[in-house]
Interface confidence: low
């Protein structure tokens, strides 16, 4: 082993290396001194550190842990912030569209019934955008909304265009009468079952991406222990204190240190992986009525089917809503001619036919693949940051926390330690409570996302979702079914090209990350970078 | 560009109220999410409240549940944080911040931030 330095040596190297990291050089000692007052360099021989110095690489040692951590996760979290907002506005962009199909259906079909009907559409499809963003809209009341406000609409335009001004006080009869006559037949029933399934997994979807932007988030801004302070800076600084200065730490002492201070975040470990694997299997059950995009760009036949249904009703339901909500005399019905074959305007509808174009679901699974290879992200990550901070090379001629070793020895090393202070104690302690708590909302979020679930192998029949209600001939993988029910239905070949429209419709401004204004936390990690450049340990 | 602009902080004795207010301008107020959030000296930013762009679902940390009231008004683009109950715990840098996408606790679903108000209770 090589011998300490001799007393009467400088300790110039060691002033300089120090002035890069508190400038101004009172704290450092012109020569080697016994150290005595030292409690993590503990000197075997003079030494060229001082109490305060120690206290500085401690607080250096820390801030460099806390930076290799943030650049660790830097990818992951930008993957999941970057499709949280992605998904986020192709959602947008599904509910605008669904509103501007159904729109178009009313004014190309039954164009007495607008502008009412364009504002009951536009009520429904805002209140979908904020349940799908976290509010606590009942689907059921939004379905219901959309045909107790619509009825008494079509029963004076289209089935009874003749009442008289003096009539029109029933509205809150026939909203009434909607629902007791089910005037609708199963349509809204369809339709809440549909559209509650599919954003319910949509809106699950983006819980699960906001909470994983969380999970990063917290691990990213850990706070690390003193004690973790302390073997830090036994590893990365005490050789200095020696005059050793361009010597590296052995490569098994850095894992068994990382281990030790990470070992609350490794716990996250077995709840992460369970998240994306939960998440994976949702994302495989989005289809049919589990697919918002599918759904909601249906809606517009479903509704027109249901007015249809309405109509070939109408003679008897005129009668019995005279009666039920009390006319003064009998109205003849009479009511316009509406084509039984569904019109819509081709603008609407036009559709970019590209070669391999990317849908919503092609997306979520690219998602899901990049994800998973982050899944062993949280084990990985004390050998993660060993392997970006300086190791020796195959743990010879390195630092093993107390001296320059020829080869690194565990056993060693771990004895070396007890008397300082125990590393089994630092395990033992359990995670922060922060930590605590985001394993408790991944635990929250995993149960969510297996109830979720669509049971393994499960086989719709053939044109029966389980509610029994047929649900449209959506054939082969190719032509995804937008529409309800018969004659009415459209195909699109693939959708819509949500991601080129993106492209279009994304308000640059708007996606994370590209704010021209910072926010403090910017300020703060910029600054923190620069720290990191000044205090680094990296030789 | 949305600008947010906050006001209303001040000094106020623990066991008092204030009413916190962020002026927003720049784009349609109705298709933001708001939140307020703190920061303390030499600690993390804290999510304190949250509210939906309609203002029908708002959300608290669990610390100010029962004494912040956060609300909007979306005819005057203004978000509100009413305090009441204040603790010295309570004295921070409140921000208000604007999200037209996903919003939730984490700072960084949060695209635009005021400049920040300060609360200071004594005790």
């Known amino acids: 082993q090589p011998p300490p330095p001799p007393p009467d040596a400088t300790c110039h190297q060691v002033r300089s290396f120090f002035q890069r990291l508190q400038p101004g050089l009172k704290w450092v000692p012109e020569t080697p001194v016994p150290g005595s007052d030292l409690q993590v360099c503990l000197p075997k021989g003079p030494t060229c550190c001082s109490r305060k110095m120690e206290e500085k690489y401690q607080l250096t040692a820390r801030l460099n842990m806390e930076q290799l951590l943030q650049s660790a996760s830097m990818e992951l979290k930008f993957l999941i912030i970057q499709n949280a907002a992605v998904f986020q506005e192709a959602f947008e962009i599904v509910v605008r569209h669904a509103k501007n199909y159904t729109n178009a259906m009313f004014k190309n079909n039954y164009p007495s019934l607008t502008p009412q009907a364009f504002e009951f559409v536009g009520e429904f499809f805002t209140d979908v955008s904020l349940y799908i963003l976290g509010s606590d809209i009942n689907v059921d009341d939004m379905v219901n909304e959309l045909f107790d406000s619509l009825f008494p609409v079509i029963y004076t335009q289209l089935m009874n265009p003749g009442l008289p001004d003096s009539a029109l006080d029933i509205n809150e009869c026939l909203r009434g009468a909607r629902r007791d006559l089910k005037v609708f037949g199963n349509f809204p029933k369809l339709i809440m079952t549909q559209v509650s399934k599919s954003l319910q997994v949509t809106r699950i979807f983006l819980q699960a991406l906001n909470l994983g932007i969380e999970v990063i988030n917290t691990t990213d801004h850990l706070k690390f222990s003193k004690d973790c302070g302390r073997m830090l800076t036994r590893m990365w600084y005490c050789s200095y204190c020696q005059g050793l200065m361009m010597v590296k730490p052995c490569g098994g002492y850095c894992n068994v240190v990382m281990q030790g201070c990470m070992a609350g975040v490794v716990e996250i470990d077995k709840y992460w992986r369970e998240y994306i694997l939960s998440l994976e299997e949702l994302v495989n059950g989005m289809y049919r009525i589990y697919d918002m995009e599918n759904v909601l760009l249906g809606l517009f036949s479903t509704i027109h089917d249901s007015i249809q249904y309405v109509q070939k009703n109408a003679g008897k339901l005129t009668t019995t809503i005279g009666k039920l909500c009390a006319h003064s005399q009998q109205r003849q019905y009479r009511s316009a001619y509406y084509p039984e074959d569904l019109f819509i305007d081709k603008k609407v509808l036009k559709v970019a036919h590209v070669e391999h174009e990317e849908t919503l679901s092609s997306r979520r699974r690219e998602l899901i693949q990049k994800l998973k290879s982050f899944i062993s992200f949280y084990s990985a990550l004390p050998g993660y940051i060993c392997s970006h901070s300086p190791v020796a090379e195959n743990d010879t001629l390195c630092w093993n926390g107390q001296e320059l070793v020829e080869r690194y020895s565990q056993k060693a090393a771990r004895n070396g330690m007890k008397n300082q202070f125990n590393l089994h104690e630092l395990k033992m302690k359990g995670p922060e409570p922060v930590v605590s708590q985001i394993i408790d909302k991944l635990k929250h979020i995993n149960q969510l996302l297996r109830t979720m679930s669509m049971p393994k192998g499960r086989v719709l029949d053939k044109n029966l979702d389980e509610e029994g209600f047929e649900s449209g001939d959506c054939g082969d993988d190719e032509d995804e079914c937008i529409g309800g029910s018969g004659d009415g239905m459209i195909k699109v070949k693939n959708q819509l090209r949500f991601l080129a429209e993106l492209a279009y419709d994304l308000d640059v401004d708007d996606a994370p990350g590209n704010s021209q204004q910072a926010t403090p936390k910017d300020n703060e990690i910029s600054t923190f970078h620069n720290l990191g450049n000044v205090h680094s340990p990296l030789k | 560009q949305v600008q947010l602009v906050e006001s209303g902080g001040g000094l106020v004795q623990a066991g008092g109220s204030l009413r916190l207010s962020c002026a927003f301008s720049?784009?349609?107020?109705?298709?933001?999410?708001m939140a307020w959030f703190r920061q303390a000296p030499g600690k993390g930013r804290d999510f304190v409240a949250r509210?939906?762009?309609?203002?029908?679902?708002?959300d608290y940390a669990d610390s100010v549940k029962g004494r912040f009231t956060v609300s909007r008004d979306n005819a005057k683009n203004t978000v509100s944080l009413q305090m009441s109950s204040l603790k010295p715990d309570d004295a921070a840098l409140y921000y208000c911040?604007?999200?037209?996408?996903?919003?939730?606790?984490?700072?960084?679903?949060?695209?635009?931030w005021g400049q920040g108000t300060q609360v200071t209770v004594s005790s």
């Open positions: 911040a604007a999200t037209s996408g996903i919003y939730g606790e984490s700072y960084n679903l949060y695209n635009y």
């Open positions: 509210v939906g762009p309609s203002g029908r679902t708002t």
């Open positions: 720049g784009r349609t107020f109705s298709k933001y999410a």
